[in-house]
């Protein structure tokens, strides 16, 4: 059985979430990967995705989200810059592998963003910045519209910390390709 695990990140507005998703298998290196938010009772929403095929060390930017796939390490690096309180929520990485369902990567990320910029960021000390310079060679990738006969039967489990997610949508600029994909356990 799949064991859903979460990593909690507590950051201030203006800081950067900088995390990695481990995709384990070399066969997934070139697969398209996506960063999703999970809201209780809803299907995950894709906020950004890599190109197809996914290129090595090639930044893809969608609004304030930057994805970089490092094939040599089997890791997808995800950055969300200039965080806002409304970004709080549960996130996950998935690998698109049509016609099969997306392959979910652990751990899920429980992000808690609080008001007030602090010079002592704690858990994200290397990634604190109000102004973020976007790499010059970023690309915007179109995320595939993925459909499946399976439907959501239950909400994803809540964190033990039980952090509430704001009802408002995430305010990410230039996100034109938000899609829905099914939850699977």
């Amino acid at each position: 059985a799949t064991k859903l695990t979460e990593e909690k990140y507590e950051l201030k507005e203006g800081q950067t979430l900088d995390v990695k998703c481990d995709y384990t298998l070399e066969k997934f290196a070139s697969s398209q990967k996506a960063w999703q938010i999970i809201r209780d009772g809803e299907m995950p929403k894709t906020l950004a995705c890599t190109e197809r095929p996914s290129k090595n060390s090639h930044p893809v930017q969608v609004g304030r989200i930057i994805l970089e796939d490092y094939h040599d390490h089997g890791l997808l690096r995800v950055r969300m810059v200039n965080l806002q309180v409304e970004d709080s929520g549960l996130y996950q990485c998935v690998i698109y592998q049509p016609p099969k369902e997306p392959h979910m990567l652990f751990d899920r990320i429980r992000l808690v963003v609080t008001k007030g910029f602090s010079g002592t960021p704690g858990s994200n000390e290397n990634s604190t910045q109000n102004v973020y310079k976007i790499p010059p060679t970023t690309t915007k990738a179109l995320c595939p519209l993925y459909t499946s006969p399976r439907t959501v039967t239950q909400a994803p489990p809540k964190s033990t910390a039980d952090v509430s997610t704001p009802d408002s949508e995430i305010n990410l600029t230039n996100v034109t390709d938000i899609i829905r994909v099914p939850v699977f356990n």
């Epitope: 799949t2 900088d18 990695k20 390490h73 690096r77 858990s123």
Partner: antibody, heavy 117, light 111 residues
């Protein structure tokens, strides 16, 4: 070529601390995890913990909580392992390793730490 | 933590024959349809080398005579045909959950 270069052997007194270094070449440590592994003479391998250099987050084996502190300096692509309150049980070779496929690859050559009065 | 028990502790195999090393986990190391079991080889005076990751995937530059299998709690490393160069210690390691843990090791020698 991808490489991890570790600091030279250390001879330290009981009760003292030691800080080992591991410098990456051929890749940026921000883009991976760095792990540390202990191997006592003629014995097996023990995972100490790992760091995500991009955000400073660390994970440790319970046995090494309070004993080991893992840090990283991304400007020099160097990870560090500090060991405190050293005893003879800490005499070992300490390896840093890069990360691949949910495990460890790109091993450093190891640093021998000898605790002796 | 997940405890890994390797067997046998030592093994002698004739050149050209098959060597099989087993590793049993105290609980399943499967998650998301993947077995998080890895195998390392360590020769005397050398650093460990990744042979197999995720139960059955060969590490970079690893000869085809090394193969891994298993799922859940029971895994094995097979070496066939055995060569002189394969004399070493072999360790299994799980990366399903922290703390990552290693088996006690198996010493493989030529008979």
């Amino acid at each position: 070529a991808v490489q991890l270069q570790q600091s030279v052997a250390a001879l330290v007194r009981p009760g003292a601390s030691v800080k080992l270094s591991c410098t990456a070449s051929g890749f940026n440590i921000k883009n991976t995890y760095i792990h540390w592994v202990k191997q006592r003479p003629e014995q097996g391998l023990e995972w100490i913990g790992r760091i995500d250099p991009a955000n400073g987050n660390t994970k440790y084996a319970p046995k090494f909580q309070g004993k080991a502190t893992i840090t990283a300096d991304t400007s020099s692509d160097t990870a560090y392992l500090q060991l405190s309150s050293l005893t003879s049980d800490d005499t070992a070779i300490y390896y840093c390793t890069g990360h691949y496929g949910s495990t460890m690859d790109y091993w450093g050559q190891g640093t021998s730490v000898t605790v002796s009065s | 933590e997940i405890v890994l028990t390797q067997s046998p502790a030592s093994l002698a195999v004739s050149l050209g024959q098959r060597a099989t090393i087993s590793c049993r986990a105290s609980e399943s190391v499967d998650n998301y349809g993947i077995s998080f079991m890895n195998w390392f080889q360590q020769k005397p005076g050398q650093t460990p080398k990744l042979l197999i990751y995720a139960a059955s995937n060969q590490g970079s530059g690893v000869p085809a005579r090394f193969s891994g299998s298993g799922s859940g709690t029971d895994f094995s490393l097979n070496i066939h045909p055995m060569e002189d160069d394969d004399t070493a210690m072999y360790f299994c390691q799980q990366s399903k959950e922290v703390p990552w843990t290693f088996g006690g090791g198996t010493k493989l020698e030529i008979k």
